[in-house]
């Protein structure tokens, strides 16, 4: 590894109303020549490491979280690794970690508050 992948998430919690959709923002800076085939993106529940959503081997592997999550596929190549969480429930409240690996890796956690 030549240097950590810088992963950026908002410092403040994301606040969402029950039943609405929430976007957990996460971004990284792709190097010149970056292709999605190099990307391993894993969203997990921070504390338990439960898989939420992933993008590996050049394709979206889908939701592992009650089929209520989605990425923004058209924006991934530009470094947008944000996760859309649909029909937010009270039980969704907590910390989600965005893990990005492109040769090297980095990760950051974003908190979701449900109102």
């Amino acid at each position: 590894p030549t240097g950590a992948v810088e992963v950026q998430v908002p410092e403040d919690p994301v606040v969402a109303l029950v039943g609405t959709d929430a976007t957990l923002r996460c971004s990284f800076s792709p190097e010149p020549g970056f292709s999605l085939a190099q990307l391993n993106l894993i969203w997990q529940l921070t504390d338990t490491k439960q898989l939420v959503h992933s993008f590996t081997e050049g394709r979206d592997q889908g939701s592992a979280y009650a089929n209520r999550t989605a990425l923004f596929p058209d924006l991934l190549a530009q470094g947008n690794a944000s996760l859309r969480l649909q029909r937010v429930r009270v039980a969704d409240e907590g910390s989600f970690t965005c893990f990005v690996s492109i040769r090297d890796f980095g990760s950051a956690a974003v908190s979701l508050q449900v109102a």
Epitope: K49, L51, T56
Partner: antibody
Framework: QVQLQESGPGLVKPSGTLSLTCAVS?????????WNWVRQSPGKGLEWIGE???????NYSPSLKSRVTISIDKSKNQFSLKLNSVTAADTAVYYC?????????WGQGTLVTVSS | EIVLTQSPGTLSLSPGERATLSCRTS???????LAWYQQKPGQAPRLLIY???SRATGIPDRFSGSGSGTDFTLSISRLEPEDFAVYYC?????????FGQGTKVEIK
């Protein structure tokens, strides 16, 4: 290239506190990564101890949680492990390592023996 | 916690032969949440494979990972002298992260 180096006493008395430091070079400890302690003993193999994020957030192994404290010093680009009330069962090689999921790179490890 | 069981404990092979190492998890995990390490005497473990099948930087293509559910495999297509070592699997689909007990690949 990020490199890690553990340091600290190689001998700790039973019921005492094990204290180790991991110096990070070749990169900033403030980058978006988790910093971990892992130990390896003949009896228990490789065992994850805990992790810290640059914000100071920590997660610990349930089996060691009551005895472990991991802290970070961004000004010195290092993080530390304290394990109290040690017994002979805590004798192991202690490694520091980077990563939220898998670990890469690792320090070279330091042997800590608990004995009177 | 998830328990990882590796087999065999020791594998005795000659250089040039193929090595197949097994790792079984006590609970099913997504394949992208498994890693493999190599450890030589007196050294720290070195990351070989992550995401079940992605090679870490600088790892030769004779190393490959596969598997799903509870059964995972590390294959070394043609053993080189430097490949004789202990290999560990590790899961990161559940906290705490846990390791297998290791498989030693020794020269026959």
């Amino acid at each position: 290239q990020v490199q890690l180096q553990e340091s600290g006493p190689g001998l700790v008395k039973p019921s005492g506190t094990l204290s180790l430091t991991c110096a990070v070079s070749g990169g900033s400890i403030s980058t978006s990564n988790y910093w971990n302690w892992v130990r390896q003993s003949p009896g228990k193999g490789l065992e994850w101890i805990g992790e810290i994020y640059p914000t100071g957030n920590t997660n610990y192994s349930p089996s060691l949680k009551s005895r472990v404290t991991i802290s970070i010093d961004k000004s010195k680009n290092q993080f530390s492990l304290k394990l109290n009330s040690v017994t002979a069962a805590d004798t192991a090689v202690y490694y520091c390592a980077r990563g939220y999921n898998y670990f890469d790179p690792w320090g070279q490890g330091t042997l800590v023996t608990v004995s009177s | 916690e998830i328990v990882l069981t590796q087999s065999p404990g020791t594998l005795s092979l000659s250089p040039g032969e193929r090595a197949t190492l097994s790792c079984r998890t006590s609970q099913s995990i997504n394949a992208i949440l498994l890693a493999w390490y190599q450890q030589k005497p007196g050294q720290a473990p070195r990351l070989l494979i992550y995401g079940a099948s992605s090679r870490a930087t600088g790892i030769p293509d004779r190393f490959s990972g596969s598997g799903s559910g509870t059964d995972f495999t590390l294959s070394i297509s043609r053993l080189e002298p430097e490949d004789f070592a202990v290999y560990y699997c590790q899961q990161y689909g559940s906290s705490p992260r846990t390791f297998g007990q290791g498989t030693k690949v020794e020269i026959k």
